[in-house]
Interface confidence: low
C-alpha cells in the first residue's frame, strides 16, 4: 500500500493549472513517433506564449547501432529505425534570450526561462486531458539545506576542469528543489561480513563507530537531492558469514538479497540493506539492483570495503544505494554536479556530489511510487545514531524534532528547544497526525496501489500509520493469468508496457524461445562469471523480457540497445539497457511472473509455484469474504470483520487499522 | 461502512445552478478520493467530476468543463458539486462515490467502492 500521492503543489506558493495545445499537428493523445520540432501554446499569468521546441539531436544519434555476437564469434550489427525520443531544447517566441528545456514524454515536464521570470511545468497528477501545472521557480517553497560540500570544496574541484563551467552546487540545489521538495527518509541497514570485520581486529565498537561514521557521510552527501540517510540497523557476521560469498559479485548479490528477504527484514524493517565486505571481485567495487528501494526482495547492495579510507568508500556505498534508489550511471549522459566526476560515474572515484541526472533518476522513481516506503519518517527507536536536538531526526528520548530554531517557528506543535510535544499536542508528525492531533481511527493513511495490495488506516492512537502490508504472495489476479508478488501483479504484458508503451504486450512463446537459447546479451537466463546463460527452453520466459506491437522507444534516462527479432510472423522485441557489471538488468522477466500453470520465474528459472508458501485457503480461514495478506491475516472485504470475516463489520484485517471509528466525532462540527 | 447520502437536486429551469451535496456517515472521509457520475434514462452511467482526498486536484468531464465546480469539506466529511449555467441535457440522477485507490482513475466507475442512492436533476428548457 502507498501513501495517497497528492503531494504535487504542497511546495508551492501559488500556480496555474493549464491545458497546453500543440500547434504543429494534433495535441498527442496515444502513443506515436515524437516529433522533431513541436510548437505549443502554454498559458501563464493570463499571457499565452508559443514556445517552439526542437528534438535534443544528440541524445540518440541517427546512427544508433546495436552490436551483438553469435555463437561463432562474429560481430553482428543492427540499428533499429526508432528515433523518437521525447527529450527537447527551444525558445519562447518573441522573448529575447529565452531558453527551454522540456521532455515531452509523458506530458511537458521542465523550465521556461523568460526574461524576467523562470517557469516549472510538470503533468497534472491524475488528469487524463493534458492539464499541466506551471508555477514560477520563486513560488518554489525552499525549505533550508545543508549542502554536503562546501563552497571551497566547490571552487577546489571545480578550478581542475576549467574548460567547462558546471552549475554551482547553490544553482544545482535551487533547481533540484523545484522536483523534490518533500523530505525522502532511508531506512538503512548495514551487515558487515567476516573477513571486514576480522581486519578491524575483530572489535565490535570500532565497527560500529565506522559505520555510524559511513552513515553520516551518507547524509551529508544525500542531503542535496532532500534525502536523509537513517542508519536503523547494523549487524556484523561476527561467527562467519551467513551467505556464500564465493563466486562473482552478481552471485553474491543474489544470496544477500535472499538471505535479506528470508531473515533480515522479518527482524527488522528498513528500507535498503547494504553488505559491507572486505573480498573484492576484480575492479567491481559493488553491485546493486536498480529502483528497488521499497522492494522485499530486491533493495540491496553488496559494497567492497578493502584498503581504502571510510571517506572514499562511502561514495562507494552512495553510488549504490543511488541504483536501489533508481540511478543509473552518468557516463555517456548529459549531466552536471558541480565537480569534475559524479556519484554516480560508473567508476568508483569518490566524488560526494550527485548530478543533475541522478536527481532526474530519483525523481522518475519517486513519481512512479517506487519510492513510498521512503516517505515515512522513522520513529526515535528505529534511529541508529547519536540523538541530537534540532538534526530534524526524532531520535531516542525526543517526541519531535523541528529543527533549527527558525524552522521550528513555524512548527505548530513541537517545542523546538526541548525536543518534546507542546502541551496540548499529542502529536507533530507522521501520517496520522493533523493539526496535532491524531487522526481519527479508520481514517485511511496508505491506499492500495495495485490488486494485489490492501489499505491501512489510522489507528486513533498513533501517528503513524499501520505498518504496509499486501496480498500475500501466490495469490492469483489478473483474472487468475498471474500471481502476486510483493504487492504486485506480476505478467508480461504489464512489463512490456513499462518497457515499450501502453499498446506494447507479451511476444509469443516462440519469441522467448528462440532469442532466450542464444546466450548473448540479448537472449539470456542470467550471467555466471563472464558467462551469460542460455536458457534451457523450460526457462525460457523466465529470462530477456520479449515483446511485441512496440510503439515506443523506452526512455529511462539512458539510451538502452534495442534488438528486433523476427519470428514466426511477428517482432520480438528486447532491451538491453546497458546499465554496466554493478547492475542486474532491468530487460529481464520479473520475479514472480506466472511461466506457466502452476509455475513462477525465480532466479531466470520457471519454478513450481509452491516456491511462494502460499497457504491460504480463503474459503476456510476467511469464510469466502477476504484474502490472505503478508502476515497470513486475513483482509476482509466491506461488510465483514476481521479477524476471520466470518462476522458482520466493516472489512480490514488485524493488520490494517480499524477501518471504522464508533465515536467519529473528530472531523464532524 | 461508509454511506454516502446526496442531497440538494430538484427541478431548475435553463441556465439556473444547483449545489449537490455528499455527506459520508459513521466513517471518517479522509482519504477517500470522490467522484460525482450522473445517469439519465436509457443511458450509461457518466462520469461528471472528480476530487482527490486532499482537495487539492480536480478532474471534470468536457461537457461539464467550466460549468461545474466539485469542492469538499473534510471536516464537515461532505463533497460538493456547484452547478451553472444548466442545460437540459444536465437531466439525470446524479451519484456521488468514494474510492480508496491510489491512482484514482478518476472516470473509471468501477474502481468507485461505495456509491450513494443518486439524487435526481431536472433541467427544463
Known amino acids: 500500500a502507498a501513501r495517497p500521492g497528492f503531494q504535487q503543489t504542497s511546495h508551492l506558493s501559488s500556480y496555474e493549472i493549464i491545458t497546453p495545445w500543440r500547434l504543429t499537428r494534433e495535441r498527442r493523445e496515444a502513443p506515436r513517433p515524437y516529433s522533431k520540432q513541436v510548437s505549443y501554446v502554454i498559458q501563464a499569468e493570463g499571457k499565452e506564449h508559443i514556445i517552439h521546441l526542437e528534438r535534443n539531436k544528440d541524445l540518440l544519434p541517427e546512427d544508433f547501432v546495436v552490436y551483438t555476437y553469435n555463437k561463432e564469434g562474429t560481430l553482428i550489427t543492427d540499428h533499429p529505425n526508432i528515433q523518437n525520443h521525447c527529450h527537447y531544447r527551444g525558445y519562447v517566441e518573441g522573448v529575447h534570450n529565452s531558453s527551454i528545456a522540456l521532455s515531452d514524454c509523458f506530458g511537458l515536464r521542465g523550465l521556461l526561462h523568460l526574461e524576467n521570470a523562470s517557469y516549472g511545468i510538470e503533468p497534472l497528477q491524475n488528469s487524463s486531458h493534458f492539464e499541466h501545472i506551471i508555477y514560477r521557480m520563486d513560488d518554489v517553497y525552499k525549505e533550508p539545506l545543508k549542502c554536503g560540500v562546501s563552497n571551497k570544496d566547490i571552487e577546489k574541484e571545480t578550478a581542475k576542469d576549467e574548460e567547462e563551467e558546471p552549475p554551482s552546487m547553490t544553482q544545482l540545489l535551487r533547481r533540484r528543489r523545484a522536483v523534490l521538495p518533500q523530505t525522502r527518509y532511508v531506512e538503512l541497514f548495514i551487515v558487515v561480513d567476516k573477513e571486514r570485520y576480522d581486519m578491524m581486529g575483530r572489535n565490535q565498537t570500532a565497527v560500529r563507530e565506522e559505520m555510524i561514521l559511513l552513515a553520516n557521510y551518507l547524509d551529508s552527501m544525500y542531503i542535496m537531492l532532500n534525502i536523509r540517510i537513517v542508519l536503523v540497523g547494523l549487524e556484523i557476521w561476527t561467527n562467519g558469514n551467513l551467505i556464500n560469498i564465493v563466486g562473482g559479485a552478481g552471485d553474491v548479490l543474489g544470496n544477500f538479497v535472499q538471505w535479506r528477504e528470508k531473515f533480515l527484514i522479518t527482524r527488522r524493517r528498513h528500507d535498503s540493506a547494504q553488505l559491507v565486505l572486505k573480498k573484492g571481485f576484480g575492479g567491481t567495487a559493488g553491485m546493486a539492483f536498480v529502483g528497488t528501494v521499497c522492494s522485499r526482495s530486491h533493495a540491496g547492495g553488496i559494497n567492497v570495503f578493502g584498503q581504502i579510507t571510510v571517506e572514499t568508500f562511502a561514495s562507494i556505498v552512495a553510488h549504490e544505494l543511488g541504483h536501489n534508489l533508481g540511478m543509473n550511471h552518468d557516463d555517456g549522459r548529459d549531466c552536471s554536479c558541480g565537480a569534475k566526476s559524479c556519484i554516480m560515474n560508473s567508476g568508483a572515484s569518490g566524488s560526494r556530489n550527485f548530478s543533475s541526472c541522478s536527481a532526474e533518476d530519483f525523481e522518475k522513481l519517486t513519481l512512479n511510487k517506487g519510492g513510498n516506503c521512503l516517505l515515512n519518517i522513522p520513529k526515535p527507536d528505529e534511529a541508529y545514531s547519536a540523538p541530537s536536538c534540532g538534526n530534524k531526526l526524532v531520535d531516542a528520548g525526543e517526541e519531535c524534532d523541528c529543527g533549527t530554531p527558525k524552522e521550528c517557528e513555524l512548527d505548530p506543535c513541537c517545542e523546538g528547544s526541548t525536543c518534546k510535544l507542546k502541551s496540548f499536542a499529542e502529536c507533530a508528525y507522521g501520517d496520522c497526525c493533523k493539526d496535532c492531533r491524531f487522526l481519527p481511527g479508520g481514517t485511511l493513511c496508505r491506499g492500495k496501489t495495485s490488486e494485489c495490495d490492501v489499505p491501512e488506516y489510522c489507528n486513533g492512537s498513533s501517528q503513524f500509520c499501520q505498518p504496509d502490508v499486501f496480498i500475500q504472495n501466490g495469490y492469483p489476479c489478473q483474472n487468475n493469468k498471474a500471481y502476486c508478488y510483493n504487492g504486485m501483479c506480476q505478467y508480461y504484458d504489464a512489463q512490456c508496457q513499462v518497457i515499450f508503451g501502453s499498446k506494447a504486450k507479451a511476444a509469443p512463446k516462440d519469441c522467448f524461445i528462440e532469442v532466450n537459447s542464444k546466450g548473448d546479451r540479448f537472449g539470456n537466463c542470467g550471467f555466471s562469471g563472464n558467462e551469460y546463460k542460455k536458457c534451457a527452453t523450460g526457462n525460457a520466459l523466465c529470462g530477456k523480457l520479449q515483446c511485441e506491437n512496440v510503439q515506443e522507444i523506452p526512455v529511462f534516462g539512458i539510451v538502452p540497445a534495442i534488438i528486433q527479432t523476427p519470428s514466426r510472423g511477428t517482432k520480438c522485441w528486447g532491451v538491453d539497457f546497458q546499465l554496466g557489471s554493478d547492475v542486474p538488468d532491468p530487460g529481464m522477466v520479473n520475479e514472480g511472473t506466472k511461466c506457466g500453470a502452476g509455475k513462477i520465474c525465480r532466479n531466470f528459472q520457471c519454478v513450481d509455484a509452491s516456491v511462494l508458501n502460499y497457504d491460504c485457503d480463503v474459503q476456510k480461514k476467511c469464510h469466502g469474504h477476504g484474502v490472505c495478506n503478508s502476515n497470513k491475516n486475513c483482509h476482509c472485504e466491506n461488510g465483514w470483520a476481521p479477524p476471520n470475516c466470518e462476522t458482520k463489520g466493516y472489512g480490514g484485517s488485524v493488520d490494517s487499522g480499524p477501518t471504522y471509528n464508533e465515536m467519529n466525532t473528530a472531523l464532524r462540527d | 461502512e461508509v454511506q454516502l447520502v446526496e442531497s440538494g437536486g430538484g427541478l431548475v429551469q435553463a441556465g439556473g445552478s444547483l449545489r449537490l451535496s455528499c455527506t459520508g456517515s459513521d466513517r471518517t472521509f479522509i482519504g477517500y478520493h470522490m467522484g460525482w457520475f450522473r445517469q439519465a434514462p436509457g443511458k450509461e452511467r457518466e462520469f461528471v467530476a472528480y476530487?482527490?482526498?486532499?482537495?487539492?486536484?480536480?478532474n471534470y468531464a468536457d461537457s461539464v468543463k467550466g460549468r461545474f465546480t466539485i469542492s469538499r469539506d473534510n471536516a464537515k466529511n461532505t463533497a460538493y458539486l456547484q452547478m451553472n449555467s444548466l442545460k437540459p441535457e444536465d437531466t439525470a440522477v446524479y451519484h456521488c462515490?468514494?474510492?480508496?485507490?491510489?491512482?484514482?482513475?478518476?472516470?473509471?466507475?468501477?474502481?468507485?467502492?461505495?456509491w450513494g442512492q443518486g439524487t435526481q436533476v431536472t433541467v427544463s428548457s
Open positions: 476530487i482527490s482526498s486532499g482537495g487539492a486536484y480536480s
Open positions: 462515490a468514494a474510492t480508496d485507490y491510489n491512482k484514482a482513475y478518476a472516470r473509471e466507475g468501477r474502481r468507485y467502492d461505495y
